[in-house]
Interface confidence: low
């Protein structure tokens, strides 16, 4: 089965620059299929723009100005690229790549879409680092004791643009866990968002990862925030003892950033 | 020119109660085209649901039914038993791939119909309320309540900033909510919730040594441990790939 990945979830440009949007095809040989590009402007219908067929023929939708869009494919990397020249406000949109995928039954085809890349045009000069800054929250003892479950919360702040994807996995597992999230909120010139994961008691002793995709992540890789295992046999103190006032009772965390 | 027009811009549905989306074709006979349905969820993922010829996307056949009403020139998509996973924008689209005549392999889309999912009407359920802290950041977690109307207050004398709460449907078909804030005195922050004309406090759920039943530690358990606010990391974590965390008590 064909699968399309658009590694950039967003692409931020200033006016008149050139944007290059990538689409990686897997499961199908790119030189044996046509790749289509669609655009969804805010509040408008999704519209076909341009396609490149298996033999390299390019077809543009009528009414699309010539010279605006360029499409090509690189068989070696199984990638199709949509280049948007001289970006302007009316190019603000989400761009999807797509292809027709044959089904097992003869004559049945479906068109599958990539996850889309949002083109953002800005005139702001932003701080050098507008990647998401994480803060982690571990389950409260009350929740783990009373509900035999625990909630991890991953807070991400001070990022730009607003396009962000968050998912959760257990360490050493590729299964995406069912999580919940708040809306992305604007704070001054940047954005914040949080996501939370509730796991049953039996999973609290496993390490969990909050995985964040954002245009401005360092080195362009997904950021992984590690949530350490929780010991559920940790027991109660006299509630009158306020451990936060007594350094001997608190847990100190040495936090070391290790890029990999 | 051909146009696909959804019947509604927004369709609220209840969990488990069938819902029907309709999309009419203007300017052409719907029978001359193949109709497709897609769903766009949070994060812009466009997922194929249905195409004429009884083709369904993976995982859609059991809970979705596509149909064409030739007489009314419209396409119909039925969600047989909606769940919270079905929230999103639904698009009808048409093509003439393989129909002969003008070979159009592009899709022509209609505007989306936003499907919002609400829990079924059910007995009222009081929330559980828990506080989570890290540095100046405080999160109030409100779990498993119904109905939706709720006011969440983080109680502090030294507020830096607060954010609007996120209220979502829980996997069990009730609501969960989280409210975040930043406070100079985060250690002393508690959370109180107004729901269904009652007030629920996070302190109601704190584990006490003299509590009874399932809260009481078993005799085999160690009885000395940090209090609930002590197993929170104190620092903000800035990571790229790995956190090396060493714990010292």
């Amino acid at each position: 089965a064909g699968h399309l990945e658009q590694p950039q979830i967003s692409s931020t440009k200033t006016l008149s620059k050139t944007a290059r949007l990538e689409c990686v095809v897997s499961g199908i040989t790119i030189s044996a299929t046509s790749v289509y590009w669609y655009r969804e402007r805010p509040g408008e219908v999704i519209q076909f723009l341009v396609s490149i067929s298996y033999d390299g023929t390019v077809r543009k939708e009528s009414g699309i100005p010539s010279g605006k869009f360029e499409v090509d494919r690189i068989p070696e990397t199984s990638t199709s690229t949509l280049t948007i020249h001289n970006v302007e406000k009316q190019d603000i949109a989400t761009y999807y790549c797509a292809l027709w995928e044959a089904q097992q039954e003869l004559g049945k085809k479906i068109k599958v879409f990539g996850p889309g890349t949002k083109l953002i045009i800005t005139d702001k000069q932003l701080d050098a680092d507008v990647s998401p800054k994480p803060t982690i929250f571990l389950p409260s003892i009350a929740e783990t004791k009373l509900q035999k479950a625990g909630t991890y919360l991953c807070l991400l702040e001070k990022f730009f643009p607003d396009v962000i994807k968050i998912h959760w996995q257990e360490k050493k597992s590729n299964t995406i866990l069912g999580s919940q999230e708040g809306n992305t909120m604007k704070t001054n010139d940047t954005y914040m968002k949080f996501s939370w994961l509730t796991v049953p008691e039996k999973s609290l002793d496993k390490e969990h990862r909050c995985i964040v995709r954002h245009e401005n992540n360092k080195n362009g890789v997904d950021q992984e925030i590690i949530f350490p295992p929780i010991k559920t046999d940790v027991i109660t103190m006299d509630p009158k003892d306020n451990c936060s006032k007594d350094a001997n009772d608190t847990l100190l965390l040495q936090l070391t950033n290790t890029s990999a | 020119a051909i146009e696909l027009v959804p019947e509604h811009q927004t369709v609220p549905v209840s969990i488990g109660v069938p819902a029907t989306l309709r999309c009419s074709m203007k300017g052409e006979a719907i029978g001359n085209y193949y109709i497709n349905w897609y769903r766009k969820t949070q994060g812009n993922t466009m997922t194929f649901i249905y195409r004429e010829k009884d083709i369904y996307g993976p995982g859609f056949k059991d809970n979705f039914q596509g149909d064409i009403d030739i007489a009314k020139n419209l396409a119909v998509l039925k969600i047989l038993a909606p769940s919270e996973r079905d929230e999103g924008s639904y698009y009808c689209a048409c093509d003439t791939l393989g129909m002969g005549g003008e070979y159009t392999d592009k899709l022509i889309f209609g505007k989306g119909t936003r499907v919002t999912v609400e829990p079924r009407s059910q007995p009222h359920t009081k929330p559980s309320v828990f506080v989570m802290k890290n540095g100046t950041n405080v999160a109030c977690l409100v779990k498993e309540f119904y109905p939706k109307d709720i006011r969440i207050n983080l109680v502090s004398s030294k507020k830096i900033t607060e954010f609007d709460p996120a209220i979502v449907i829980s996997p069990s078909g009730k609501y969960n909510a989280v409210k975040l804030g930043k406070y100079e005195d985060s250690n002393s922050v508690t959370c109180s919730v107004q729901h269904d004309n009652k007030t629920v406090h996070s302190t109601d759920f704190e584990v006490k040594t003299d509590s009874t039943d399932h809260v009481k530690p078993k005799e085999t358990e160690n009885t000395k441990q940090p209090s609930k606010s002590c197993h929170k990391p104190k620092a903000i974590v800035h990571t790229e790939k790995v956190n090396m965390m060493s714990l010292t008590v």
Partner: antibody, heavy 121, light 112 residues
Framework: QVQLVQSGAEVKKPGSSVKVSCKAS????????INWVRQAPGQGLEWMGG????????NYAQKFQDRVTITADKSTNTAYMELSSLRSEDTAVFYC??????????????WGQGTLVTVSS | DIVMTQTPLSSPVTLGQPASISCRSS???????????LSWLQQRPGQPPRLLIY???NRFSGVPDRFSGSGAGTDFTLNISRVEADDVGVYYC?????????FGGGTKVEIK
Amino acid sequence: QVQLVQSGAEVKKPGSSVKVSCKASGGTFNIYAINWVRQAPGQGLEWMGGIIPFFGTANYAQKFQDRVTITADKSTNTAYMELSSLRSEDTAVFYCARGGDSGYDWGFDYWGQGTLVTVSS
Amino acid sequence: DIVMTQTPLSSPVTLGQPASISCRSSQSLVHSDGNTYLSWLQQRPGQPPRLLIYQISNRFSGVPDRFSGSGAGTDFTLNISRVEADDVGVYYCMQATQFPLTFGGGTKVEIK
């Protein structure tokens, strides 16, 4: 326009069975409930049971449970009601009716023309 | 089973005058999903029944606005604001909240 067309009138002997058909056209057959309703001469309406073809399983009124079988053929958009062990008091007009937009719960929005079954020795 | 009781059994009315039919259920018709699945049907002489009102008060497509439904819980009413000759027939209430689906005994509307 949705239409439900039923098979013709039948005369049956006591103890025998009758199978009435109901062919749907002009709408989606699969996802609506097709119900069967009995109306004895000069009497009111009585629900016998119904089926949602998509799911394939039928629901029956207790009174008819042992004698009625409701089926659906998705390929021909046709529903069937078979009533066995007929007795004279089964003489009635049998209607098929489509449940509304959510299976059973709208009420019955479209009705067949009715099939008169006469049970007589 | 839910028993549906209609009153009156028969209602002679003058053309142009209003008519009202009552339907009472033996238990609440509020479904666990919050909806109330009570509908009204009209059966003209020699014809199959026809849906007028669904979910208490929603008029089915093509039904004149002189027909209206109201009620809640266990008590429901069908109103005809100005009776026309065409309205002669038997009117049934029906519940689809719980299996088995059940009908009222019917109310005959005739012209005086």
